[in-house]
């Protein structure tokens, strides 16, 4: 299936724009802003879909201890240079000539640099720590109703198989959902754990990317779960290189 | 409480195709996938493929070689099955089961369905 | 595809005395910790029912005597002490990787 056949749609990304003129009069959707062809039943690529965001205003935005070497999107929007594939390419520039490398959900990991700056591969994200912080309930939530519904979510929605869902922890009020995707274990038609973690995050902000369908209502056992606050860290396979100037 | 229930038994000649029926009932049809699985008389259980019904797309085990096509309508909260070139060796009962929460367990199935083929 | 192998095919036993059934699988269902492993009962006539999902969490309404075991690629189910009504075929299921798979079941009969 590449888009609802009857509305001619992309229930999976409402940036796009759909007419019948694949083979056959079947549905066929390109994304806003690159124009490529997506698969709309699974989730669109992050790289299609902040090329797609261009126009969008940027918006800032233990349990677990990320690891020195986890990055945070501090960067906010860019408009990213995509491959064939819709994947980030591993080195992005901006109109002054400013380049940095990416990671594969394209956050920097290394120093801003020059047009000779070098990105000799795409370095995977295997390791996404969402830490959510939700809003006061009248009592704590079951942590294996969390759990499982959570996962059920991850499944349903994102169609990320629970095997990449590594675990969910939970200390109310911070709930932290590890998704995890060694290069290995990806098959082809797996949902990359990035392009999930993404959906998640605007579904969380009330910015669904999901056509036609309401926000995201989160319940566990009937009891709405609000969030409140969210913060992405993100694991490379490679560590990030930074220069010592930026840490301090 | 969550009720899946299937259609009644068939008996079919070979070359002919079956369609089997799973209405849900009792929870958001459109919060869990739906499953088929078969067991043929004196084999182990099979499954056949599971369609997500929140999107309506379908995968599928490769054995069975583009001969089933699983759908739903969501408006009737129900999920289908159909088997195209029957042979002998389909006759089988034919389940549907839904996923659980978290770990792709099946928490509930119907009934099943028998369906025979013979000339 | 991953093949799961049950042991013993048949296991005879009385009420009150403890079952212990074996599902060894082809290659490894653990992901971070998570085993893809789940047990179900199947009577005659009947559709099966989940018993033990992710290799040893007891599903909602499941007697306590049942209880499972075991990661990677060496499974149990333990029943502790036989009620007339645990007399059935058990089944183990992957549900790590398409095709999701089913072992050929071990029957519990009374002696």
């Known amino acids: 299936h590449t888009a609802a056949q009857d509305n001619c749609t992309c229930p999976t990304n409402k940036m796009t724009v759909c007419s019948p003129d694949g083979p056959g009069g079947r549905c066929q959707c390109r994304a806003l802003g690159s124009g490529m062809a997506v698969d709309c039943s699974t989730l669109t690529s992050k790289c299609l879909l902040l090329k797609a965001r261009m126009s969008a205003p940027k918006n800032a935005r233990t349990l677990v201890r990320p690891s020195e070497h986890a990055l945070v999107d501090n960067d906010g929007l860019y408009d990213p240079d995509c491959d064939p594939e819709g994947r980030f390419k591993a080195r992005q520039c901006n109109q002054t000539s400013v380049c940095w490398c990416v990671n594969s959900v394209g956050v920097r990991r290394t120093d801003k640099g020059d047009l000779s700056l070098r990105c000799d591969e795409l370095v995977r994200t295997h390791h996404i720590l969402i830490d959510l912080r939700h809003r006061p309930t009248a009592g704590a939530f079951n942590h294996s109703d969390l759990d499982a519904e959570l996962r059920r979510l991850f499944r349903e929605r994102y169609r990320l198989h629970p095997k990449f869902v590594a675990a969910v922890h939970y200390e109310q009020p911070t709930i932290q959902i590890e998704l995890r995707q060694n290069t290995s274990q990806k098959a082809a038609g797996d949902v990359d754990i990035g392009d999930a973690a993404y959906y998640f995050e605007r579904d969380i902000k009330g910015e669904s990317l999901f056509q036609g369908r309401g926000g995201l209502d989160l319940r566990v056992r009937g009891e709405p779960l609000q969030v409140e606050r969210t913060l992405i860290y993100y694991l490379d396979e490679i560590p990030p290189k930074f220069s010592m100037k930026r840490l301090t | 409480q969550v009720q899946l229930v299937q259609s009644g038994a068939e008996v079919k000649k070979p070359g002919a195709s079956v369609k089997v029926s799973c209405k849900a009932s009792?929870?958001?049809?459109?919060?869990?996938?739906i499953n088929w699985v078969r067991q043929a008389p004196g084999q182990r259980l099979e499954w056949m493929g599971v369609?997500?019904?929140?999107?309506?797309?379908?995968s599928y085990n490769q054995k069975f070689k583009g001969r089933v096509t699983i759908t739903r309508d969501t408006s009737a909260s129900t999920a289908y099955m159909e088997l195209s070139s029957l042979r002998s060796e389909d006759t089988a009962v034919y389940y549907c089961?839904?996923?659980?929460?978290?770990?792709?367990?099946?928490?509930?199935w119907g009934q099943g369905t028998l369906v025979t083929v013979s000339s | 595809e991953i093949v799961l192998t049950q042991s013993p095919a048949t296991l005879s036993l009385s009420p009150g005395e403890r079952a212990t059934l074996s599902c060894r699988v082809s290659?490894?269902?653990?992901?971070?910790?998570?085993?893809?492993m789940h047990w179900y009962q199947q009577k005659p006539g009947q559709a099966p029912r989940l018993l033990i999902y992710?290799?040893?969490n007891l599903e909602s309404g499941i007697p306590a005597r049942f209880s499972g075991s075991g990661s990677g690629t060496d499974f149990t189910l333990t029943i502790s002490s036989l009620e007339p009504e645990d007399f059935a075929v058990y089944y183990c299921?992957?549900?790590?990787?398409?095709?999701?798979?089913f072992g050929g079941g071990t029957k519990v009969e009374i002696k």
């Open positions: 089961a839904r996923y659980g929460d978290g770990y792709n367990q099946f928490d509930y």
């Open positions: 009792g929870y958001t049809f459109t919060d869990y996938s």
């Open positions: 369609i997500s019904t929140y999107y309506g797309d379908a």
């Open positions: 290659e490894s269902v653990d992901s971070y910790g998570n085993n893809f």
């Open positions: 992710r290799a040893s």
């Open positions: 299921q992957q549900s790590y990787e398409d095709p999701y798979t």
